[in-house]
């Protein structure tokens, strides 16, 4: 016929067939994969399908029932005797629910022509499937040439054995896809051209990438694209209590599979990932950064009583430096070093100790040496200042010994060895140190520097001076060497326990050179620089108390 208009639309009721036990095979397949959304499944329709056949003696509905006596809508045609068959079966309108590419799964049996008696030359082993797009739910009364052919359907395995009753019937399954679709819905049509077919099931579906949580991002149900090779980029949204610095995306393939994940979400500070969700850190646990994987137990000497903690609070008397990460244990300043001993020689003091009994919980203990110089008479101590050198260093000392070079001789020192760590400066408590008192050995004194002239006469010169800056012991005596200028090889030595002398027997109006040195038990110091003084002329007056520059 040139037109399908006015198709026979009375319900198609054929004989009530027995349960063919194809039912079992069908029903086990009723559950579609999660990425397939059925638009029509003839197996699940309980009432009339509303399909129509034209002509009316072509396709017929046969009332199959399954093992639960639920109907199976089966359509059969076996017009193999006559040539030029053109039997149409039209579905009702099928909404595409926004899908632009749909799939049609047919389950059918198609009888091998050789199994029919008499070798019918008119018998065919294929049928045709068509579709027609329409926004109109009542638009199937159209000319058959408006239907677009999807494909010619042939059995992958046409059969001669019909396993029915206590046997298993062989069902052929063929799937075709159609797209892109542009209207709200469509009709399907099945054209028989002279085959012996039973159409047992028609399932129309589209594919979607099902809603999924991946990398803590929720990706919504996404209908696949119209093109079989198309990948749709879909943005995910982070689950509750998660954040991202690399927005999550995935690609939905035409087969309904999520591919090529990009980016991810991370549970924010105070939350950790469990079963695809972000769960709060329990009291006693914390997570400082989204980049951390799990909530961690509070580090030693810290605690938290709240949920969702991003850090833990230090216990009393314990501290954490500002630069320390929250994962670091809280520590306290170390106790004092122990068992400090000293060793003194002429040029240095060597100190040694053992580490404190309590390091405060950290491994960053270092030592600070404070040097005090004490006046033995007054009992007053002052910081040593720069005259002592520390080897290897005074501050941040890692080993448990130090050497002080260039100490003053015959001096009382107090060395305070303090153990410190990163939190020592945060603690309001008193310093923890061990003291070592050291008296250095006597040494040769330093040179005399300050010499003043006293009474100068024609035959004598009186001088006075101050004790050397560094006596380095008890001054036993001074030695004064003098000679007439330019007569250095002919000198005179005077010894004096005082800091004054008078040189006599000198020539009038002559220049004399004086040098003074002090002696301790350790020996003489070096001579002072040369001081020049001139005797008066025979008739000159004496000159008192002028300091020699």
């Amino acid at each position: 016929p040139a037109s399908l208009a006015g198709c026979y639309s009375a319900p198609l009721k054929g004989p009530l067939w027995t349960c063919l036990l194809l039912c079992a095979a069908l029903r086990t397949l009723l559950a579609s994969p999660s990425n397939e959304v059925n638009l029509l499944d003839s197996r699940t329709v309980l009432g009339d399908l509303g399909w129509i056949a034209f002509p009316k003696n072509g396709w017929e509905e046969i009332g199959e029932v399954d093992e639960n006596y639920a109907p199976i809508h089966t359509y059969q045609v076996c017009k193999v005797m006559e040539q030029n068959q053109n039997n149409w079966l039209l579905t009702s309108w099928i909404s595409n629910e926004g899908a632009s590419r749909i799939f049609i799964e047919l389950k059918f049996t198609l009888r091998d022509c050789n199994s029919l008696p008499g070798g019918l030359g008119t018998c065919k082993e294929t049928f045709n499937m068509y579709y027609f797009e329409s926004d109109d739910e009542n638009g199937r009364n159209i000319k058959d040439n408006q239907y677009i052919k999807i494909d010619t359907i042939a059995a992958d395995e046409s059969f001669t054995e019909l396993d029915l009753g206590d046997r298993v019937m062989k069902l052929n399954t063929e799937v075709r896809d159609v797209g892109p679709l542009s209207k709200k819905g469509f009709y399907l049509a099945f054209q028989d051209v002279g085959a012996c077919i039973a159409l047992v099931s028609v399932r129309v579906y589209y594919k979607k990438c099902p809603s999924v949580v991946r990398h803590l991002a929720v990706f919504p149900d996404t209908i696949t694209g119209a093109d079989s090779s198309q990948l749709l980029e879909v943005s995910g949204s982070c689950v509750n209590h998660s954040v991202t610095d690399d927005p999550p995306k995935m690609h939905c393939s035409a087969e309904g599979e999520w591919l090529v994940p990009i980016g991810k979400c991370m549970c924010k500070a105070g939350y950790e990932e469990k079963n695809g969700t972000c769960q709060v850190c329990r009291p006693g646990f914390f997570k400082a950064s989204p980049h951390s994987q799990t909530c961690s137990k509070c580090p030693p000497h810290s605690y938290t009583h709240e949920e969702a903690s991003t850090s833990c609070v230090c216990e009393k008397d314990y501290f954490r430096r500002e630069s320390d990460p929250p994962t670091m244990a809280c520590t306290r300043p170390p106790s004092a070093p122990r068992n400090a001993i000293s060793n003194v020689n002429e040029t240095s003091v060597f100190l040694e100790w053992i580490p404190p009994a309590d390091t405060g919980g950290g491994k960053d203990v270092s030592y600070y040496i404070l040097c005090k110089k004490c006046n033995s008479h007054a009992g007053v101590c002052e910081e040593c200042g720069g005259h002592v050198r520390y080897l290897p260093q005074q501050i941040g000392l890692k080993n448990t010994s130090v050497m002080m070079a260039d100490p003053l001789a015959h001096t009382n020192y107090t060395f305070e060895i303090e153990a410190v760590n990163g939190v020592s400066d945060l603690s309001p408590g008193t310093r923890q140190y061990v003291s070592v008192n050291v008296t250095t050995n006597q040494a040769a004194p330093s040179p005399v520097t300050n010499v003043k002239k006293g009474k100068i006469a024609k035959n004598s010169i009186s001088l006075s001076w101050q004790e050397p800056d560094r006596p380095n012991g008890i001054i036993l005596e001074y030695e004064i060497k003098y000679f007439e200028k330019d007569q250095e090889t002919s000198y005179t030595i005077i010894k004096s326990k005082e800091t004054t002398i008078t040189a006599e027997g000198l020539k009038p109006a002559s220049v004399y050179v004086f040098q003074i040195r002090a002696r301790t038990a350790a020996g003489y110091g070096v001579f002072s620089r040369r001081f020049e003084f001139e005797t008066t002329p025979v008739f000159g007056a004496s000159n008192d108390q002028s300091q020699i520059p």
Epitope: L20, C78, V80, M81, E82, L162, L164, C196, A198
Partner: antibody, heavy 121, light 106 residues
Framework: QVQLLQSGAEVKKPGASVKVPCKAS????????MSWVRQAPGQGLEWMGW????????TYAQGFTGRFVFSLDTSVSTAYLQISSLKAEDTAVYYC??????????????WGQGTLVTVSS | EIVLTQSPATLSVSPGERATLSCRAS??????LAWYQQKPGQAPRLLIY???TRATGIPDRFSASGSGTDFTLTISRVEPEDFAVYYC????????FGQGTKVEIK
């Protein structure tokens, strides 16, 4: 109503011929093959063969070639069985039966009432 | 030619009882087997085709099974109108009938 109507009983002498008609009604005659079955008195059923009502192509069972001819007149939706050179052993009831071909199998689903052909001298 | 052998030749049953008829083929006919019922003076009636599919209008007390060479027709509860001769017929290769089984009242 689908039915096959056969003629009444025939009595023939040996060597004669007989033509048994089978008129179909209630369906499209050319959509179904027509089969012929013989049942001798007190005996079982014997399939004689069938004719494709669309092409007129006959198929004969073993033992039913030569003297037996299937034919059609589609204009009156009638199939015919002609037996020539009748013998006494041809005495039997001859049935025509419509052949229903389905995906699930074949069967003779509509039968004529039968025509008794008696061959006697 | 495929030979069909039916057994028993005669089956005596009481109304309401179960009747089981057998048909054996000399070679495999797959599922290409039909069963017919014939009452005296009447034409045969198609009961089953495709080895197990009931024909239109056949009560569900008639069931059949089998494949290959061994087939069974079962009448679950025999009714008075079921007393008749039953024939099996194969259409796997040419067409042949079995010799029939008579179901009679016991």
């Amino acid at each position: 109503q689908v039915q096959l109507l056969q003629s009444g009983a025939e009595v023939k002498k040996p060597g004669a011929s007989v033509k048994v008609p089978c008129k179909a009604s209630g369906y499209t005659f050319t959509s179904y093959a027509m089969s012929w079955v013989r049942q001798a008195p007190g005996q079982g059923l014997e399939w004689m063969g069938w004719i494709n009502t669309n092409t007129g192509n006959p198929t004969y069972a073993q033992g039913f070639t030569g003297r037996f001819v299937f034919s059609l007149d589609t204009s009156v939706s009638t199939a015919y069985l002609q037996i020539s050179s009748l013998k006494a052993e041809d005495t039997a009831v001859y049935y025509c039966a419509r052949v229903r071909l389905t995906v699930y199998g074949d069967g003779m689903d509509v039968w004529g009432q039968g025509t008794l052909v008696t061959v006697s001298s | 030619e495929i030979v069909l052998t039916q057994s028993p030749a005669t089956l005596s049953v009481s109304p309401g009882e179960r009747a089981t008829l057998s048909c054996r083929a000399s070679q495999s006919v797959s599922s290409n087997l039909a069963w017919y019922q014939q009452k005296p003076g009447q034409a045969p009636r198609l009961l089953i085709y495709g080895a197990s599919t009931r024909a239109t209008g056949i009560p569900d007390r008639f069931s059949a099974s089998g494949s290959g060479t061994d087939f069974t027709l079962t009448i679950s509860r025999v009714e008075p109108e079921d007393f008749a001769v039953y024939y099996c017929q194969q259409y796997g290769s040419s067409w042949t009938f079995g010799q029939g089984t008579k179901v009679e009242i016991k």
